[in-house]
């Protein structure tokens, strides 16, 4: 995933005893929070694997890349990064693997330059619908976010609220239409069973969509038509059985797309004929020669590109009177 990268060379670590003494005042220009490493030259602050339970209050105003990975933050409250003066330069924020289970409304408010946010590997049982939009208005101020990385944010089964996890994530993505400028969205490894049909229509700027390693069985009700400039669609390692004509036509109509379909349990029966024909003609599928059948048993490991219509049959459905018990 595209987490913020640092060219930091000369990091300075602050002494832990400085931490609380100045937290109430604006940070000094060269100050570095306790348990963090800072490089003003690289505009980077790293507070990594330090078991922090809250976001440091005394972050330097120059920070452009902030790593808060491998901590124990638990909750990200409203205005978690609001400072006076604001962190006006902060462009890339990585909070992955920090045991966050709740992100509240307005958690990322007052970050006018925030382009890249990584919340991966946090068990987000409670993601507020207004986590990214900051307000419950029907149309919010546009978020500056360009990349949103939400890989493996599904909480354990027993920690989920009594609602659809997919629905919770989609509500946060669509609230207030704030993410209209989003270009990269990664939702890999989240046990998604389906993709709510309205989500893609409202993210028209998407260039990269990663839905790999989920449990998607079908794309029948998903429309890609609005994603006019989609460049990559990662659907590897799902539970897809076949892509139907409507989906195939939509994908073929996107002039910049590359589609990644490896490791799906393709069912090679009569319903697969259109997809096989399409695969033989299209250039949009990366590694299409690697796609193989999983079912039925007699077709297992056959290469889709090598199939012809005679291979793709459906067993006739017997009328009830002829079925044996």
């Amino acid at each position: 995933s595209s987490s913020p990268t640092s060219s930091a060379s000369s990091f300075s670590s602050s002494a832990p005893f400085l931490a609380s003494a100045v937290s109430a005042q604006p940070p000094l220009p060269d100050q570095c929070p306790a348990l963090c490493e800072c490089s003003e030259a690289a505009r980077t602050v790293k507070c990594v694997n330090r078991n922090l339970t809250e976001v440091p209050t005394d972050l330097p105003a120059y920070v452009r890349n902030l790593f808060l990975t491998g901590n124990q933050l638990a909750v990200l409250p409203a205005g978690a990064f609001a400072r006076r003066p604001p962190l006006a330069e902060l462009a890339a924020l990585n909070l992955s693997g920090s045991r966050l289970d709740e992100v509240r409304a307005g958690a990322f408010e007052h970050l006018p330059s925030l382009r890249q946010l990584d919340l991966s590997h946090n068990p987000l049982a409670d993601l507020s619908p207004f986590a990214f939009s900051g307000s419950n208005a029907s149309v919010s101020a546009p978020s500056p976010l360009v990349e949103l990385i939400l890989n493996h944010i599904v909480p354990p089964e027993d920690e989920r609220q009594n609602r659809s996890f997919e629905g919770m994530v989609v509500a946060a993505l669509l609230a207030g239409r704030a993410l209209q400028g989003l270009r990269r969205l990664e939702l890999a490894s989240n046990h998604f069973l389906y993709l709510p049909r309205d989500v893609l229509a409202q993210l028209p700027s998407l260039r990269h969509l990663d839905l790999s390693n989920n449990s998607l069985v079908s794309l029948t009700y998903v429309s890609f038509r609005n994603l006019t400039h989609l460049e990559s669609l990662h659907l590897e390692d799902n539970a897809l059985k076949v892509l139907h004509n409507g989906t195939l036509a939509e994908l073929q109509g996107l002039p910049h797309i590359r589609v990644f379909l490896d490791n799906n349990p393709w069912v090679c029966d009569c319903h697969m004929a259109d997809m096989v024909t399409w695969l033989k003609e299209t250039e949009v599928v990366q590694g299409k020669d690697r796609l193989t059948c999983a079912y039925p048993e007699k077709m297992r490991n056959r290469v889709l590109l090598e199939l012809n219509s005679a291979d793709l049959d459906c067993d006739p459905i017997l009328p009830p009177s002829l079925q044996t018990s």
Partner: antibody, heavy 115, light 107 residues
Framework: QVQLVQSGAEVKKPGASVKVSCKAS????????MNWVRQAPGQGLEWMGR????????NYNGKFKGRVTMTADKSITTAYMELSRLRSDDTAVYYC????????WGQGTLVTVSS | DIQMTQSPSSLSASVGDRVTITCRAS??????LNWYQQKPGKAPKLLIY???RLHSGVPSRFSGSGSGTDYTFTISSLQPEDIATYFC?????????FGGGTKVEIK
């Protein structure tokens, strides 16, 4: 913002090859597609082809097939365009342009083919 | 290949004028029509993509419209810094093709 910096001007003899490079920075938000477009002196724009940097997939304009090769080195975020069997009418400024819609352009590389 | 026919090839207008350029494709390009601005000695810059979407940082006086085969580019109030050549391009059907350009000058 994506910045594209191209290699310097080249003077080549007919029949030779030229390889132009294009380095992308501000890369986190850049596109996977890198297009190459040329412009002969005083003329319009002509699309030569494109490469998908993640997997090396290419689409070439049929006019240049067999003469043009586009490659990319992900590790240094650089794309290359090589044009072989140069002729005098290949004299042009060659641009790289990042994005499906050719969103951001390099500064151009003048290639002069002259005996 | 799809042919892109741009007109006029040049025009002269006063500061503050509304300027319109048209581009016709030889077949339906499903709104995949972009407009670029090129100043002398410089690289082209994307202004509008997918018929009417403004590229980031582009002033709102630039706009686009159209569908099917016929597309229009408009500068609502010409500014001195808009002196340039404008190109349309199809990015729907490979190979991408450009119009011949429209040179815009100040009267």
């Amino acid at each position: 913002q994506v910045q594209l910096v191209q290699s310097g001007a080249e003077v080549k003899k007919p029949g030779a090859s030229v390889k132009v490079s294009c380095k992308a920075s501000g890369y986190a938000f850049s596109s996977s597609w890198m297009n190459w477009v040329r412009q002969a002196p005083g003329q319009g724009l002509e699309w030569m082809g494109r490469i998908y940097r993640e997997d090396g997939h290419t689409n070439y304009n049929g006019k240049f097939k067999g003469r043009v090769t586009m490659t990319a080195d992900k590790s240094i975020t650089t794309a290359y365009m090589e044009l072989s069997r140069l002729r005098s009418d290949d004299t042009a400024v060659y641009y790289c342009a990042n994005g499906g819609a050719m969103d951001y352009w390099g500064q151009g590389t003048l290639v002069t083919v002259s005996s | 290949d799809i042919q892109m026919t741009q007109s006029p090839s040049s025009l002269s207008a006063s500061v503050g004028d509304r300027v319109t350029i048209t581009c016709r494709a030889s077949q339906d390009i499903s709104n995949y029509l972009n407009w670029y601005q090129q100043k002398p000695g410089k690289a082209p810059k994307l202004l509008i993509y997918y018929t009417s979407r403004l590229h980031s940082g582009v002033p709102s006086r630039f706009s686009g419209s159209g569908s099917g085969t016929d597309y229009t580019f408009t500068i609502s109030s010409l500014q001195p810094e808009d002196i340039a050549t404008y190109f349309c391009a199809n990015d729907n059907t490979l190979p991408w093709t450009f119009g011949g350009g429209t040179k815009v000058e100040i009267k």
